[in-house]
């Protein structure tokens, strides 16, 4: 988790002088509780936005937006702590809005936004906005949280972001898999425009089961430049195991931008349909 660029981040708006600061996620008001604390944020919204760095790279960011409740507690609102927790790693990053002037009621509801948390493809986050100071130990909570799922690199807008392009998102192998006679599969896919090797992983499963019954890896050496964008055809021999009929083919490239951690593409071959067993015809006709 990180913030997009390190240029000055602003949270000021008409009627409010505000500065964005790095935070340890442990606000001072936890340790030194205050008697009067503001109410919680209202209408917390998290959306996927895209932002360019100063170098011109494009990254997905969490666009966080919330409003204030229209009660007198805004008189005690000193700022907000924004926290983003990546759920699969438990990594957390926080920033603090520090209000340098007192808030006053005005004709519009106060609204705040922040769009500088860089998020990763295919990851889930918990976004929390805590109003500051935080409540006393038994006080009503004054935060709001929402989970936010970032789409993977198949998503049209994500595909062209820097992290997705680095992991090979622009390569469309257009995999086709054909079942041949004698327990064989023919796998065909389009090579990318880079002299790098690929591996094909064939994993076979019984019908309706998720425990594999066979797995085979096939290595494809780096193509020559004249083979770029051409179709590569590979014939894989299956294990002759009864019922081991559902096959998943994954192709992993080793592009220079992502090395051993490039996006894989896959295709699946289902088990052949079993013909419906016809009703047995009785050899005599009942007479009732």
């Amino acid at each position: 988790l990180r913030l997009l660029d390190h240029r000055a981040l602003v949270c000021s708006q008409p009627g409010l002088n505000c500065t964005v600061k790095n935070s340890t996620c442990l606000d001072d008001s936890w340790i030194h509780p205050r008697n009067l604390t503001p109410s919680s944020p209202k209408d917390l919204q998290i959306q996927l936005h895209f932002a360019h760095t100063q170098q011109g790279d494009l990254f997905p960011v969490a666009h966080i937006e919330w409003t204030l409740q229209t009660d007198a507690s805004i008189l005690y609102l000193e700022g907000a702590e924004l926290s983003v927790l990546q759920l699969n790693t438990n990594e957390r990053l926080c920033v603090r809005f520090e209000f340098l002037s007192k808030l006053r009621h005005h004709h519009r509801r106060w609204r705040f936004t922040f769009s500088h948390f860089v998020v990763d493809p295919d990851q889930e986050y918990e976004v929390t906005v805590h109003h500051l100071p935080k409540p006393i130990p038994d006080g009503d909570p004054n935060h709001q949280s929402k989970n936010f799922l970032v789409p993977d690199c198949e998503h049209a807008r994500m595909k062209v972001t820097t992290p997705c392009m680095s992991s090979g998102s622009l390569w469309d192998p257009n995999i086709t898999v054909e079942t041949l006679e004698a327990h064989q599969l023919r796998v065909s896919f389009t090579l990318w425009n880079e002299s790098t090797h690929y591996q094909i992983l064939l994993t076979s499963f019984p019908h309706m089961e998720n425990h594999s019954c066979f797995e085979h890896m096939h290595h494809i050496p780096a193509p020559r430049p004249e083979e770029f964008h051409q179709r590569s055809n590979v014939t894989l021999t299956l294990r002759n195991l009864k019922g081991c009929c559902r096959h998943q083919v994954q192709i992993q490239p080793f592009f220079s931008s992502c090395l051993n951690d490039c996006l894989r593409h896959s295709a699946t071959v289902s088990c052949p349909e079993m013909p419906d067993t016809p009703e047995p015809i009785p050899d005599y006709m009942p007479l009732w």
Partner: nanobody
Amino acid sequence: EVQLVKSGGGLVQPGGSLRLSCAASTSIFSSLAMAWYRQAPGKQREFVATINTGGQPNYADSVKGRFTISRDNTKNTIYLQMNSLKPEDTAVYYCNVPRYNYWGQGTQVTVSS
């Protein structure tokens, strides 16, 4: 998560032999294809050998006839027996679980007189 524990690297003279092993801590080892890769200084990681769940091996052309990959499902371990070693075999050797894209830490093999 699958942990991979390797052993067996070292310094050997040209023409000599070494055996690498890679033990995987997983209850489904026997249903996983496994592979060895290597990476020489300043070069891209390259494929060495793979073995499927039926025990059938497959080799890079550069090691065919000299290297042998094998597996022992009772010990959750794959092996790479390297004979007739050449200076160009000098590299860090990595054990790989293709299904999960897990990589061992790597073990240095140096072939030099």
